[in-house]
């Protein structure tokens, strides 16, 4: 098989800071998930990365960077409505033992008002491997820029594995995509929070093979509800 | 051509714990999810659990949670099964299996077809 | 979880017959299924996956179809060497479930 690109798949290192929401959960010092911090207390990522207990990296692009904070958690909340055999609403809030210091290098996501068109381009982001299937894993951030594709034109491809609240993105022809290590993480469109991936095809960066996220503005009631009923 | 090569039988005591090893020769199984199904004499298949070693993360049937542990070491292509608390039920040949996921992350578990399987490792629980 | 219940359990055949084997799943699968031949003291064998793709290798007398929750496994026309049992597997998400069973015999 091909290794795919050099980065995320097909990416490109982070412009430095210029993902402060970015967190990577991490199970003891091995990256576990991606996730975003959405407030001093609380971070949002995929249910599919459910552990017991995390390590949360937050505030450096670089996983060994000895300035990061680095906060335990040991409670999380999956959504209730996910499933174990569907993966549909693939989503859960950890909540940090303690705060998060907020800072130029630390900061809060910005929750969707609205549900972003396809053709919007995005942004996906993670410490997830840089090659398929053989795996490379990345010391700093990874990037790649992706367009949302609409449920219709996805269906095509995944068929019954697609649910309401998925969402697709990807490039046609292109190998650009998310990979095993970036579940959880952020894709950003117009500076609002519109994706946590979820899944993909295995070997990633498969051309014509959309990443699937957890489409977030369909979930901000939830995230709301749920962050101020367990304060 | 990748074969899955699984330890020698083994007779253990009721009570005790069994590890049995399966490598991979010929080939790596880190992109790969490995599989552990049983079969007592005389009866079916009975799937154990899973580890995909690149997605770090094991999977267990309900009926050995607790009890079974599946772990890999990428660096000799070799996955492992251990399970404890043996009992006389649990005499067995275990096998070891390989297949390739056709997703990453949530959907990582579905549909993977066992296409390699290890020879078969035969445990007996006696006293 | 996911139960597969495999009928028969035993069927008798002759050389050339046609031999029909089923399973369903308590709950729906869409199309993860598959099939294994197993001789006794061999390990199993692949034969068809995603409920009707057939292995490498394998005859094309075998065929699967079926999605959802009813599945079938047809061996065309019985040749000597397929007498063994053959076992279903839901492939849809871990903890994957083996059915129970099909042994096919000489008549």
């Known amino acids: 098989e091909e290794a795919q690109g050099d980065k995320i798949i097909d990416g490109a290192p982070c412009a430095r800071g210029s993902h402060p929401w970015q967190v990577a959960l991490l199970s003891g010092n091995q990256l576990h998930c991606g996730g975003v911090l959405v407030n001093e207390r609380w971070v949002l990522t995929a249910a599919h990365c459910k552990m017991n207990e995390y390590t949360v990296h937050l505030g450096s692009d670089t996983l060994g960077d000895r300035r990061a904070q680095r906060i335990k958690a040991s409670k999380s909340f999956r959504h209730p409505g996910y499933s174990t055999q569907t993966h549909v609403n693939d989503l859960m809030l950890v909540k940090l033992n303690s705060q998060a210091r907020l800072s130029s290098m630390v900061k809060k996501v910005r929750l969707p008002s609205r549900c972003e068109p396809p053709g919007t381009t995005c942004t996906v982001s993670g410490w997830g491997t840089t090659t398929s299937p053989d795996v490379t894993f990345p010391s700093d951030l990874m990037c790649v820029d992706v367009k949302l594709i609409s449920p219709q034109d996805c269906t095509k491809v995944y068929k019954d594995l697609l649910e309401n609240s998925m969402l697709c993105a990807g490039i046609p022809d292109s190998k650009k995509n998310a990979c095993n290590g970036d579940s959880g993480g952020p894709l950003v469109c117009r500076g609002t929070l519109q994706g946590l991936v979820s899944w993909g095809t295995f070997p990633c960066g498969q051309p014509n093979d959309p990443g699937v996220y957890t489409q977030v503005c369909k979930f901000t009631k939830w995230i709301n509800d749920t962050m101020k009923k367990h304060r | 051509q990748v074969q899955l090569v699984q330890s020698g039988a083994e007779v253990k005591k009721p009570g005790s714990s069994v590890k049995v090893s399966c490598k991979a020769s010929?080939?790596?199984?880190?992109?790969?999810?490995i599989s552990w199904v049983r079969q007592a004499p005389g009866q079916g298949l009975e799937w154990m659990g899973a580890?995909?070693?690149?997605?770090?993360?094991?999977n267990y049937a309900q009926k050995f949670q607790g009890r079974v542990t599946i772990t890999a070491d990428e660096s000799t292509s070799t996955a492992y099964m251990e399970l404890s608390s043996l009992r006389s039920e649990d005499t067995a040949v275990y096998y070891c299996a390989r297949g390739a996921p056709n997703y990453y992350g949530a959907q990582s578990s579905r549909g993977i077809a066992f296409d390699i399987w290890g020879q078969g490792t035969m445990v007996t629980v006696s006293s | 979880d996911i139960q597969m219940t495999q009928s028969p359990s035993s069927v008798s055949a002759s050389v050339g017959d046609r031999v029909t084997i089923t399973c369903r799943a308590s709950?729906?699968?869409?199309?993860?299924l598959a099939w294994y031949q197993q001789k006794p003291g061999k390990a199993p064998k692949l034969l068809i996956y995603?409920?009707?793709s057939l292995q490498s290798g394998v005859p094309s007398r075998f065929s699967g179809s079926g999605s959802g929750t009813d599945f079938t496994l047809t061996i065309s026309s019985l040749q000597p060497e397929d007498f063994a049992t053959y076992y279903c597997v839901q492939a849809n998400a871990f903890p994957y479930k083996f059915g129970g069973g099909t042994k096919v015999e000489i008549k």
């Open positions: 010929g080939g790596t199984f880190n992109n790969y999810a």
């Open positions: 709950q729906g699968i869409s199309s993860w």
């Open positions: 995603a409920a009707s």
């Open positions: 580890i995909i070693p690149i997605f770090g993360v094991a």
